[in-house]
Interface confidence: medium
Amino acid sequence: VPRWRQQWSGPGTTKRFPETVLARCVKYTEIHPEMRHVDCQSVWDAFKGAFISKHPCNITEEDYQPLMKLGTQTVPCNKILLWSRIKDLAHQFTQVQRDMFTLEDTLLGYLADDLTWCGEFNTSKINYQSCPDWRKDCSNNPVSVFWKTVSRRFAEAACDVVHVMLNGSRSKIFDKNSTFGSVEVHNLQPEKVQTLEAWVIHGGREDSRDLCQDPTIKELESIISKRNIQFSCKNIYRPDKFLQCVKNPEDSSCTSEI
């Protein structure tokens, strides 16, 4: 008789999850010499230990501490790029601007990017059928708690000038409920961070509005200012040209507004 299994509202663990995490770890440590010392088997064991045999609605940041310790990594604190609802462009940017880093350019972010995982209480099985949805089921699920933990640590490490890329095509350009809005903004350290620079990315070709005047951006400015961090905002009207100009800054067309 098949054992009863909790049915959650979200998709189940990504196929071949253990193999994917292990393979990504090996690949990352090969590409990044400063992380060559990392034992990927230990990383997988710590990752697995954070959620296996635990109720997937009762995961804590504490569960991930062994993994955090193994994945400790120093990125230049003044070269951090945060993003909200515009991951692809942020990653394209750091692929070109190699001295800047998103969370997914770090080992732990790279391991988990686009993956889903959860276990079951009191069994060592991984649940490939369904996992808790943040809204419909519970917020303390393995994936949400992981991203909250690594995002908080990433924001806490930032210094000097921190950049954030925001999606100007969305109704809420700055969303207080996003990871950026709910975690990262509140964990930037005013003693270390002088300024948050927001880059608002425009979607439409003919969109010449100043989206830095958007009410949600003003809300972000207010939150940041109250935390005694300076705030600046820039419209990126042509993201394609923006990337092109990052690649080829000498291009004569790159002197005009992008």
């Epitope: 800047m100 880059w199 005694n228 705030f231 600046s232």
Partner: antibody, heavy 119, light 111 residues
Framework: QVQLLESGGGLVQPGGSLKLSCVAS????????MNWVRQAPGKGLEWIGK????????NYTPSVKDKFFISRDNAKNTLYLQMTKVRSEDTALYYC????????????WGQGTTLTVSS | EIVMTQSPASLSASLGQRATISCRAS??????????VHWYQQKSGQPPKLLIY???NLESGVPARFSGSGSGTDFTLTIHPVESEDVATYYC?????????FGSGTKLEIK
């Protein structure tokens, strides 16, 4: 409206000490980094240092490090500059300033108070 | 520390003409999107007054005849047309990192 009012300047002998004060009004003092800037007679501006809202972080220009000490009392809306081991080159007009520059409209300076170092 | 070298030390301009003041930083004071250079005007016996912030943004209440430009290490303050009330000393200032520093100042006179 925002006001910054410095006091405590005067004549001090070389090697002596003096504490300057700056009382802030018209804004929530406890939210802002505050700065001291000085200007020697007939000379340019020199940034001395700044203090974070909760006093946990202080930065100084190298020439005054270990000699000048910035502090604040948020309950009294007051910024301080304790000057020790003063020399003739410390003779200047001392400004208290809120140098918050990112979105405009946040920049405020006091009128200054004068320190004269002479024997 | 980043040294801000300002030129000229003094400048004589005719009313209605253009006055240009330069400031060069010993290291870049810009990031991918912004330049942390600001311009102040100081009239005799008064504290400095912010004119331009982040290289090119006009502080509210400042006349549009003042403008700023530049990025990286080279910055310019332009006054056009010059008016009699513009007689003052002008300073560039960077807040890219600590210690903040100021340029040595440019004294503007009217011919």
């Amino acid at each position: 409206q925002v006001q910054l009012l410095e006091s405590g300047g005067g004549l001090v002998q070389p090697g002596g000490s003096l504490k300057l004060s700056c009382v802030a009004s018209g804004f929530d003092f406890s939210l802002y980094w505050m700065n001291w800037v000085r200007q020697a007679p007939g000379k340019g501006l020199e940034w001395i240092g700044k203090i974070s809202p909760d006093s946990s972080s202080l930065n100084y220009t190298p020439s005054v490090k270990d000699k000048f000490f910035i502090s604040r009392d948020n309950a009294k809306n007051t910024l301080y500059l304790q000057m020790t081991k003063v020399r003739s080159e410390d003779t200047a007009l001392y400004y208290c300033a809120r140098l918050w520059i990112a979105t405009g409209g946040y920049n405020y300076w006091g009128q200054g108070t004068t320190l004269t170092v002479s024997s | 520390e980043i040294v801000m070298t300002q030129s000229p030390a003094s400048l004589s301009a005719s009313l209605g003409q253009r006055a240009t003041i330069s400031c060069r930083a010993s290291n870049s004071v810009s990031t991918s999107a912004f330049s942390y250079v600001h311009w102040y005007q100081q009239k005799s016996g008064q504290p400095p007054k912010l004119l331009i912030y982040l290289a090119s943004n006009l502080e509210s209440g400042v006349p549009a005849r003042f403008s700023g430009s530049g990025s990286g290490t080279d910055f310019t303050l332009t006054i056009h047309p010059v008016e009699s009330e513009d007689v003052a000393t002008y300073y560039c200032h960077h807040s890219r990192e600590v210690p903040f520093t100021f340029g040595s100042g440019t004294k503007l006179e009217i011919k």
